[in-house]
């Protein structure tokens, strides 16, 4: 008799794919534009990325450091009107893109939470949650919570409001902290909170270090759902050299949890390459005319337009990974097992019941390496076959779909492989 199928876990929409942050509408749209109506015109692009949610803003009225002139219920007229927002929501829903609103109060000021008036601000947040939930938003984000006194209890209260409205609504909290104990204490009192942090931001050095960070985090958080990013707001290029971007895309899309990206991560947008652009929010490069300040500074391969036409580009890789992440059971909610593959490498398996299984091998080093996959580290339920088919490599030149012998696996510098193999009873 065939073995019984394992019962599928309850899946919320944010479990099914990536979130895409647009923290600065004006930088995202460029050309002196930057409003909600313009963003509506970019939803087809977001659809093409197969992202499940858009984390927007903050877009509320905020006069720098002035509580009285900060209104979480009013959209800053520079971004548009309430009607523009409603229209964006409707269009996003039609495209199955959820909208998460960032309500970090003093986003233009020194302290995001007006440290001297915490209770007033917390009440304003509560009211805003109620208001925008009814407006139809799918969730909220609050950042810099290390600056919020009694953050855990406020987050618990806001979570109750959000979940009380519907289990299908999400609360994201962001912190600049990279300290695991601080992160765990924030998570402890908030069961379904999705937390973005700087935990992985210094992991770029070695495969061993990255492996230990990821496994420590997963062990410490138990069976709760995680999110994966390198920070609460900034671009991957703020932390990583260009040669590791593909590797990190592959990793973030295949770890168990929700990958969270900032606009531009999909093309390797890098403020350092654009003189005069702010690190936190450089202008999005739609095409070569997006950055007219310095003629010739932007080449086609740095832009959405140029990369869309190149199957070997970072953007094409992002789209492929996003697509896989959203449709393969093993990547959606499969078990995770990391195992040894040799110095400089990080490797793991994702598997779910009798579905197709995935092997990820990542070479963080700048030399080519032979992988010594230690299958003995794996439980019986996740054993390795002799061969697995290459689904994709982060480097060009490999023949996709071809079976690779796992005992003879060699990786190029900074190469990541995504391989697949069938369940064997």
């Amino acid at each position: 008799r065939a073995p019984r199928c394992r019962e599928l876990p309850a899946q919320k929409w944010w479990h099914t794919g990536a979130l895409y942050r647009i923290g600065d509408l004006q930088a995202f749209q460029g050309h002196g534009a930057g409003n909600l109506a313009g963003l509506k015109g970019r939803l087809d692009y977001l659809s093409s990325l197969k992202v499940k949610g858009l984390v927007l803003g903050p877009i509320h009225k905020n006069q720098k450091d002035d509580v009285a002139q900060t209104d979480l219920l009013q959209i800053d007229p520079n971004f548009g009107s309430k009607e523009d927002f409603d229209s964006l929501l409707q269009s996003a829903k039609k495209k199955s893109i959820r909208v998460i609103l960032d309500l970090t109060p003093n986003y233009r000021g020194e302290n995001s939470w007006f440290s001297t008036q915490v209770d007033t601000v917390a009440t304003k947040v509560k009211d805003a949650l109620e208001f925008w939930l009814q407006a139809g938003v799918d969730g909220f984000q609050v950042r810099d919570i290390e600056n919020l006194k009694d953050a855990s209890s406020f987050l618990a209260e806001w979570q109750n409001i959000t979940k009380g409205f519907s289990e299908d609504r999400l609360l994201i909290a962001g912190t600049n902290s990279s300290d695991l104990q601080q992160i765990l204490s924030l998570l402890e009192s908030n069961k379904d909170l999705l937390l973005t942090s700087s935990y992985l931001s210094d992991s770029g050095s070695t495969g061993e270090h990255t492996k230990s960070l990821v496994t420590q985090y997963l062990n410490a958080t138990g069976n709760r759902w995680c999110s994966w990013s390198l920070s609460q707001a900034r671009l991957l290029t703020s932390f990583l050299p260009a040669q590791l971007l593909r590797l990190y895309q592959l990793m973030l899309f295949t770890l168990p949890g929700t990958p969270v990206f900032s606009y531009g991560d999909e093309i390797g947008l890098d403020a350092a390459a654009l003189p005069g652009q702010p690190m936190e929010a450089p202008v999005m490069l739609w095409d070569e005319s997006s950055f007219p300040d310095i003629p010739g500074a932007v080449s086609a391969n740095m832009t959405v337009k140029g990369q869309s036409e190149d199957p070997g580009s970072l953007l094409s890789l992002f789209r492929r990974l996003s697509d896989q992440r959203s449709k393969e059971r093993s990547l959606l909610h499969g078990d995770f097992h990391a195992f040894s593959a040799g110095p400089g490498l990080f490797s793991y398996i994702r598997h779910w019941d009798q579905n197709e299984r995935f092997l990820v091998v990542l070479n963080f080093g700048d030399v080519g390496l032979s992988a010594g996959l230690q299958a003995s580290d794996l439980p019986a339920s996740a054993s390795l076959p002799a061969k697995a088919d290459l689904l994709l490599s982060t480097q060009p030149g490999r023949e996709e779909g071809s079976p690779l012998e796992l005992e003879r696996l060699k990786l190029e510098p900074h190469e990541g492989l995504l391989l697949r193999f069938p369940y064997a009873a």
């Epitope: 009440t123 009211d127 805003a128």
Partner: nanobody, 125 residues
Framework: QVQLVESGGGLVQAGGSLRLSCAAS????????MGWFRQAPGKEREFVAT????????YYADSLKGRFTISRDNAKNTVYLQMNSLKPEDTAVYFC??????????????????WGQGTQVTVSS
């Protein structure tokens, strides 16, 4: 069951002011989001303003901002609408509404479970 009774309507000249009141029954008034709506003859009911449970947050229809002010006194179970610089186009029946599910009312009237009978405001030119 929540009962709402509006008062303060009447006839006023353009440029004048009125203050509408809405008294609510029930001991849990401080847990309701409250709103004001209005309906002009032959038109649909439209949103005017909403105020949160504590009164900390308010939200207004764009066209009325600056002229109308919503406030509440939880000790008196009453919500108010102060209307200044009135115009003939403000002529309508004004309704007060309570949202017992949410601390912050919304701009769509579907979220409000309880409604008053309305009070007529007429602005003559």
């Amino acid at each position: 069951q929540v009962q709402l009774v509006e008062s303060g309507g009447g006839l006023v000249q353009a440029g004048g002011s009125l203050r509408l009141s809405c008294a609510a029954s029930g001991r849990t008034f401080s847990r309701y989001g409250m709103g004001w709506f209005r309906q002009a003859p032959g038109k649909e009911r439209e949103f005017v303003a909403t105020i949160s449970c504590s009164g900390t947050s308010t939200y207004y229809a764009d066209s009325l901002k600056g002229r109308f002010t919503i406030s509440r006194d939880n000790a008196k179970n009453t919500v108010y609408l102060q209307m200044n610089s009135l115009k003939p186009e403000d002529t309508a029946v004004y309704f007060c509404a309570a949202d017992t599910r949410h601390c912050m009312g919304y701009t769509k009237d579907g979220g409000y479970a309880y409604w008053g009978q309305g009070t007529q405001v007429t602005v003559s030119s």
